[in-house]
């Protein structure tokens, strides 16, 4: 080993300068007595490297590059032995810029997987490995003390979502939570949520059915379908209101929404509908009057309302 | 303090009815399911029947049903459980229960007996 | 409907040891296992929710673990008011159904 780098910082943030000096032992016999040490970035040569004999016979070439503006490139010093390019060390430069502050965290509690599910935006690039960590503790209070840690999740490379398993988990009690980011040139956190793992609680929705027709009832009226759903038995327990929508199969219309109904509502009957028209109609249900997040739709159900009933006009008026 | 207290047990003969009541304070009654779970003497519990916080949902044990109607009167803070058709089986201690958002029972009432015997 | 099954149905321990009951459902419920404690004569307390949350007011040496169809309830070291029958509940849907029971009586 003739030569050896080092560098001010082999990771800087893009667009900063950045000093490198280059040695060569005397003992390279083979060398020129003056070598030149010449200097490349990538591909490209570089001038302005300052060269010195040091008193222990050694060279030393100092270079400075006014502005990094690439994120990954590798500096080498090289000799010119012959016709070619001898390259005696080479070192990688990292540039980019320290992470910003991760937004929009927010979290569902998942009674499925009985995990709570928190998901965040990273913020732009910062051409760097960057590490999140999705951090929080137990709070009995509303999370300006803290109590136990829970121990620290981390995401899949390249992810914005991590779940914290039951384990870890206390429901009715608050939890502070909040993502904090990491790489060479800096640390950020993202602001504390404050939260309940119930008051963020996603239900699974109903199952939409028609209504079995009862020999004693009277059948739907045209323009009007009759429905029933059966609720998410594990979230049967947990108050909910909810909303159907419904649209024509056919055609460009959007969907109208029909709501609030009482998940106990649990049968319906929904008028005011074209007649003989083929409808789509979904629900989905949320944690009421105590906070929760809204859950999927539920697969669609596809009735046709009936037809209307037959007229007795004889005449009938065009206009 | 959360308290629920029963009352309406006591002997009657088979295919008599009964009607128990479960008085509830220290909460706000009309926002919980409310439920019975019994005990026969020297056995384990058995789930009855419970009833969501408007009354629109009463699931039933297969071994009350149509025999047995949970009610609930939200502006009394009071529970029912209408017994009809009693049978010796049905000899237990009643509890009535207030349901937890994720199906647990907390708290229970102290327990009314019902003894159906001839 | 979900059998719930309790083992074992009768233990005999010593205080300070440390106890383990387990409950194993018929088919997956995920975490929706409670565990009651209940002394001869009176009713039933809650001491764990949800496979593993400790209800407000019980002692942490009760604990819960568990999810699908196996869970235990642990009790690190047994004190003597802990002397009593142990029901587990499945509450994933109706109808709610207990375990038979665990005794755990004084060796």
């Known amino acids: 080993e003739c030569g050896h780098i080092s560098v001010s910082a082999p990771i800087v943030h893009l667009g900063d300068p950045i000093t490198a000096s280059c040695i060569i032992k005397q003992n390279c016999s083979h060398l020129d007595p003056e070598p030149q040490i010449l200097w490349r970035l990538g591909a490209e040569l570089q001038p302005g490297g300052r060269q010195q004999r040091l008193s222990d016979g050694t060279q030393e070439s100092i270079i400075t590059l006014p502005h990094l503006n690439h994120t990954q490139a590798f500096l080498s010093c090289a000799l010119n032995w012959g016709n070619s390019l001898q390259i005696l060390d080479q070192v990688e430069l990292r540039a980019g810029y320290p992470p910003a502050i991760p937004h929009n965290l927010s979290c569902l509690m998942n009674l499925t997987t009985s995990s709570l599910i928190c998901q965040w935006e990273p913020g732009p690039e910062t051409h760097l490995p960057t590490s999140f960590t999705l951090k929080s503790f137990k709070s009995r209070g509303n999370c300006q003390t803290q109590g136990d840690s829970i121990l620290d999740c981390v995401p899949k490379d390249g992810q914005s979502h991590c779940s914290i398993p039951r384990k870890h988990l206390l429901l009715y009690q608050n939890m502070g939570i909040w993502v904090q980011a990491e790489n060479a040139l800096g640390t950020s956190m993202s602001p504390q949520l404050c939260l309940d793992p119930m008051d963020v609680v996603a239900l699974e929705p109903p199952m939409l059915r028609t209504m079995d027709p009862s020999p004693e009832a009277a059948p739907p009226q045209a323009g009007c379908l009759q429905l029933s759903w059966e609720p998410w038995q594990p979230g049967l327990h947990i108050n909910q209101k909810c909303e159907l929508r419904h649209k024509p199969q056919r055609g460009e219309a959007s969907w109208a929404l029909v709501g609030p109904l009482p998940l106990e509502a649990l049968q319906y009957e929904l008028c005011g509908l074209l007649p003989a028209t083929a409808y789509t109609l979904q629900i989905r249900c949320i944690r009421w009057p105590l906070p929760g997040h809204w859950s999927d739709w539920s697969p669609s159900l596809e009735l046709r309302t009936t037809e209307r009933a037959p007229t007795h006009h004889h005449h009938h008026h065009h206009h | 303090e959360v308290q629920l207290l029963e009352s309406g047990g006591g002997l009657v003969q088979p295919g008599g009815s009964l009607r128990l009541s479960c008085a509830a304070s220290?909460?706000?009654?009309?926002?919980?399911?409310m439920g019975w779970v019994r005990q026969a003497p020297g056995k384990g519990l058995e789930w009855v029947s419970s009833?969501?916080?408007?009354?629109?949902?009463?699931p039933y044990a297969d071994s009350v049903k149509g025999r047995f109607t949970i009610s609930r009167d939200n502006s009394k803070n009071t529970l029912y459980l209408q017994m009809n058709s009693l049978r010796a089986e049905d000899t237990a201690v009643y509890y009535c229960?207030?349901?937890?958002?994720?199906?647990?029972?907390?708290?229970w009432g102290q327990g009314t007996l019902v003894t159906v015997s001839s | 409907d979900i059998q719930m099954t309790q083992s074992p149905s009768s233990l005999s321990a010593s205080v300070g040891d440390r106890v383990t009951i387990t409950c194993r459902a018929s088919?997956?419920?995920?975490?929706?296992l409670n565990w009651y404690q209940q002394k001869p004569g009176k009713a039933p307390k809650l001491l764990i929710y949800?496979?593993?949350n400790l209800q407000n007011g019980v002692p942490s040496r009760f604990s819960g673990s568990g999810s699908g169809t196996d869970f235990t309830l642990t009790i690190s070291s047994l004190q003597p008011e802990d002397f009593a029958t142990y029901y587990c509940?499945?509450?994933?849907?109706?109808?709610?159904?207990f375990g038979g029971g665990t005794k755990v009586e004084i060796k």
């Open positions: 229960a207030k349901l937890g958002e994720l199906g647990w029972f907390d708290p």
């Open positions: 220290g909460f706000t009654f009309s926002l919980y399911w």
């Open positions: 009833i969501s916080s408007s009354g629109g949902v009463t």
């Open positions: 088919q997956g419920i995920s975490s929706y």
């Open positions: 949800y496979a593993s």
């Open positions: 509940q499945q509450s994933y849907s109706t109808p709610l159904t």
